[in-house]
Amino acid sequence: EEELQVIQPDKSVSVAAGESAILHCTVTSLIPVGPIQWFRGAGPARELIYNQKEGHFPRVTTVSESTKRENMDFSISISNITPADAGTYYCVKFRKGSPDTEFKSGAGTELSVRAK
């Protein structure tokens, strides 16, 4: 049970176009030290969706809901969903360094978009 877990409880989420999508992620430890980032897709071509420290992400807000001692909430909400937003979203823990290195990823949440 080495170190932390990144938990994405929803395998899939379906949202009507124009609505907001909440993507849930909890992390069981801050150690190793380093940021949490959200991506759409996997591999080198993945798209950065949210990084708290830097960048401009006008459609993304953070929605921490958990008050449990045993984990911390790093969920996000994406507003005004369009069909172009469909895909699999990953919550990823990085280990702080120069540069930061990927430590562990959640299993992913597939976002599908319904017509209005």
Partner: antibody, heavy 118, light 111 residues
């Protein structure tokens, strides 16, 4: 009942070494991040060292980096702080503390006193 | 380093009245809506005890006369109503970024 019992404190001369131990019981030690925090009348509470649940990652403030080494033995539910090149300013009560999430300090031991003086 | 300024250094409050302690961080301790500021109580000769975690969450077993609030850089611990057993020193602590740091403490006494 959670218990953290520190030992190994004492009087040591500047430049000397001490090894502090912390024996844990009453919780799943191997699942917890563990830390040492010290307290002095002058400087209040000061974080000293942290180790990840599996022992892979350790963190120290600049004030002790290179002089203190933190380790753990999950099979023995024990935490160890090796303190070398001790200085007068290291004089303090040293507390062992657990952190389920590597965030807040949930449980604290009663502390062990380290005095560095010639 | 994140510097935490805690005030006041000491506080005398009548039994049954409200005690309010403040901590201000030199930079935000928030991440994804989590505020990584925590509060501890320390009585003489004892180790610190966790009261409030992540700004506003009451630790299990802690009386609900203790409450925490705040976000980003400004945080408050409130004890209402103050009881005799609450005489202690209270500390805030940030775990948003290394090195983790503590406030200087507030000694609460009965007026």
């Amino acid at each position: 009942e959670v218990q953290l019992v520190e030992s190994g404190g004492g009087l040591v001369k500047p430049g000397g070494s001490l090894r502090l131990s912390c024996a844990a019981s009453g919780f799943t030690f191997s699942s917890y991040v563990m830390s040492w925090v010290r307290q002095t009348p002058g400087k209040g509470l000061e974080w000293v060292a942290t180790i990840s649940s599996g022992g892979t990652y350790t963190y120290y403030p600049d004030s002790v980096k290179g002089r203190f080494t933190l380790s753990r033995d999950n099979a023995k539910n024990s935490l160890y702080l090796q303190m070398n090149s001790l200085r007068a300013e290291d004089t303090a009560v040293y507390y062992c503390a657990s952190q389920l999430t590597g965030s807040e300090f949930d449980y604290w031991g009663q502390g062990t006193t380290v005095t560095v003086s010639s | 380093d994140i510097v935490i300024t805690q005030s006041p250094a000491s506080l005398a409050v009548s039994l049954g009245e409200r005690a309010t302690i403040s901590c201000r961080a030199s930079e935000s301790v928030d991440s994804y809506g989590n505020s990584f500021m925590h509060w501890y109580q320390q009585k003489p000769g004892q180790p610190p005890k966790l009261l409030i975690y992540r700004a506003s969450n009451l630790e299990s077993g802690v009386p609900d006369r203790f409450s925490g609030s705040g976000s980003r850089t400004d945080f408050t611990l409130t004890i209402n109503p103050l009881q005799a057993e609450d005489v202690a020193t209270y500390y805030c602590h940030q775990s948003a970024d290394l090195p983790w740091t503590f406030g200087g403490g507030t000694k609460v006494e009965i007026k």
